[in-house]
């Protein structure tokens, strides 16, 4: 679809005569008839196959024709066509004299013709005007012409319809050849596909408008290249969605069980050595001079009762000093000047002579110790209770009072809340520091797996093309993580790879 445009510029008829040679009275009131038709080697009369147009009276005898596209498109003259422009044409321009106001062919005498010109040739579509001048014996006509495409038609022959658009069926303008030129940020055959944010992950991200990156289920981050770990994952990471791979020192389904209390919490004070002894349990080995579960208590050097035989201990800056009772001497009052005759053994201890009566030794009854059986036995000095248990002297024996979650003579055993099989429907029991946790089989939930729920959405293997299936525990649905080259909620559609 296009328009043949003819711009009349000047007509010269100085003598004001008709084609017959007869003069016009009072002058030649001139109008034009134009016939556009298919190419003919010799232009002959006949149907104007491409169209016709007539002008009103434009002047008398000789005159210039003004541009007048405002008044209904009078000059240039418009000859629209609704077909593919063939590239060739024939053009007939007739100048007529109008004696009256009726310009219809049937209303004019045949001899009212002033001049007739006919041209033919090739004409390509374009914006440039071709200037031409045709001269006869008595007249001269100067004009120019061109063929342009109608609005929304493009190409060498105006055959390609293209309408710019900016909606969801395309975001483009039209090139001179009628091909689409995508607006910035759009691609695809019809410029309907947005170009996502640069770097947006090909499989895990998508967009509905340019420079956007929306994440598919299980992925997050500006470029949708970070997986979302299992809901509730505390000290863990993922490489594919809904995983929970524990960081070093952590365990359990949600990586919330501390397997390295020593490193994470550094509970042992004053340079003590920390040893992990189970989940959230540890033992501190104190340096000399310190005591307590966390070696937080500084020992006085006298706390170890270094003075024997009833000697009293005095702390000094550089150590301690023993004040010995009568009959004893030495750094620790360990040497005696007494003999069995002096009844040196206390608390029912029996005395035995040594070295021909120059010395003695006391044999102590149970619960007493010391050179003279003067000390009550403290069975707790060796700190025998593990896991922070408190040691209690009980006559001839000792007893450990254990912290919650521990048992055994020395609190060395972790109390198993799982012993009574509290998890229903075949759930797996995990001991925690303050209780237990049940891992339920597919189809059950609740603290003790007592609630029947829907079966694992991945159990039916819904994902195709070796995609990985993940169950979204929050919605009981599955998510397929597609391998490269496949899309769709089940990865069932292959993508045409470049």
């Amino acid at each position: 679809s296009g328009v043949f445009q003819l711009q009349l510029q000047e007509f010269i008829n100085e003598r004001g005569v008709l084609a017959s040679g007869r003069p016009c009275e009072p002058g030649c009131r001139t109008f034009f008839r134009v016939c556009l038709k298919h190419f003919q080697a010799v232009v002959s009369p006949g149907p104007c196959t491409f169209g016709t147009v007539s002008t009103p009276v434009l002047g008398t005898n000789s005159f210039a024709v003004r541009d007048d596209s405002s008044g209904g498109g009078r000059n240039p003259l418009q000859l629209p066509f609704n077909f593919t422009w063939p590239g060739t044409f024939s053009l007939i321009i007739e100048a007529w004299h109008a004696p009256g106001d009726d310009l219809r062919p049937e209303a004019l005498p045949p001899d009212a013709l002033i001049s007739k010109i006919a041209i033919q040739g090739s004409l390509a579509v374009g914006q440039n005007w071709l200037l031409d001048e045709q001269t006869s014996t008595l007249t001269r006509l100067r004009y120019s012409y061109r063929v342009i495409c109608s609005d929304n038609y493009y190409g060498d022959n105006c055959s390609r319809l293209c309408k710019k658009r900016n909606d969801h069926f395309g975001h483009y303008v039209c090139q001179p050849d009628g091909n689409l030129s995508c607006l910035p940020g759009w691609t695809g055959e019809y410029c309907q596909q947005p170009i996502c944010l640069s770097g947006c992950h090909e499989q895990n991200g998508y967009c509905s408008k340019p420079a956007e990156c929306l994440c598919r289920p299980g992925w997050q981050g500006r470029l949708c290249n970070e997986c979302i770990p299992h809901n509730g994952c505390r000290h863990g990471t993922c490489s594919t969605p809904w995983q929970c791979t524990c960081d070093e020192g952590w365990g359990g389904l949600f990586c919330d069980q501390d397997l390295n209390y020593c490193t994470h919490h550094s509970p042992c004070k004053n340079g003590a050595t920390c040893s992990n002894s189970g989940q959230r349990s540890y033992t501190c080995t104190c340096r000399p001079g310190y005591t307590g579960v966390d070696c937080e208590l500084e020992l006085s050097e006298c706390d170890s009762n270094p003075c024997r035989n009833g000697g009293s201990c005095k702390d000094q800056e550089d150590g301690y000093h023993c004040l010995c009772p009568p009959g004893y001497y030495g750094l620790h009052c360990e040497h005696s000047t007494l003999s069995c005759a002096d009844s040196p053994c206390f608390n029912g201890g029996s005395c035995r002579e040594r070295n021909q009566g120059a010395n003695y030794a006391c044999e102590c009854p149970p619960n007493f110790t010391g050179s003279n059986c003067e000390k009550k036995v403290d069975r707790c000095t060796s700190n025998p209770c593990a896991n922070g248990g408190q040691c209690l002297n009980r006559g001839p024996s000792r007893m450990c009072r254990c912290r919650p979650g521990f048992t055994g003579t020395y609190c060395e055993l972790h109390v198993s809340d799982c012993a009574r099989n509290p998890c229903a429907h075949g759930g797996t029991c995990h001991d925690l520091e303050n209780g237990l946790m049940c891992t339920c089989p597919a189809g059950f939930s609740g603290r003790r797996c007592e609630v029947r729920t829907s079966i694992d959405a991945c159990a039916s293997s819904p994902c195709f093309n070796r995609a990985t299936c993940y169950t979204d525990l929050s919605t009981d649905t599955f998510v397929c993580n597609c391998p490269y080259g496949f899309v769709g909620s089940r990865c069932e559609f292959p993508v045409g790879l470049p």
């Epitope: 609005d151 929304n152 319809l161 309408k163 710019k164 658009r165 900016n166 909606d167 969801h168 069926f169 395309g170 695809g188 055959e189 019809y190 309907q192 596909q193 998508y206 509905s208 899309v487 769709g488 559609f493």
Partner: antibody, heavy 121, light 107 residues
Amino acid sequence: EVQLLESGGGLVQPGGSLRLSCAVSGGSISSSSYYWGWIRQAPGKGLEWIGDIYYTGSTYYNPSLKSRVTISVDTSKNTFYLQMNSLRAEDTAVYYCARQALAMGGGSDKWGQGTLVTVSS
Amino acid sequence: EYVLTQSPGTLSLSPGERATLSCSGQRLGDKYASWYQQKPGQSPRLVIYEDSKRPSGIPDRFSGSNSGDDATLTISRLEPEDFAVFYCQAWDRDTGVFGQGTKVEIK
């Protein structure tokens, strides 16, 4: 040949909601060449475009209905859906699903047979 | 809100006659117009898309044009099966818009 089949129509109370399905057979809903649309026609009246969806999930709605309408797609089921809330008597219509072709400037070259939704107490 | 107005509302013609249906909208010529035929109790059927193109299976007696503010559907010689309601449709930004329809009935 591609065929579209609507389901889910029937009688709905005023203020209620509807969920219609359009199952596509004979072709993939995941084709990049089509949008999938919903159009309705009240008894004795003309056609009214409701909205459409691309296989990626991008949606477009008639502004006059946007607040009450949601269109979604399940590529695994080759089906798309129309959810419409706060229904009133004037929503009574035959609801059609249609395929809108990019190669046809958005013209709807395939239509379902329609499903009647009646809103009445 | 973009509006498409079809005229006439009803066209009474005899088989063999020429039918000319009009659809008007502001600068409609800058948009692609589609035409649909709907018979009673049936779904609409696309007969013209992108102003003047016919889908496969549509006879060549159906033709279309679109320029300025008007799109036209022409049926050169009406056949008995052509009598129906015809709707024009165009896209305004991201919204589909239909005309109110023209009924072509047997005279």
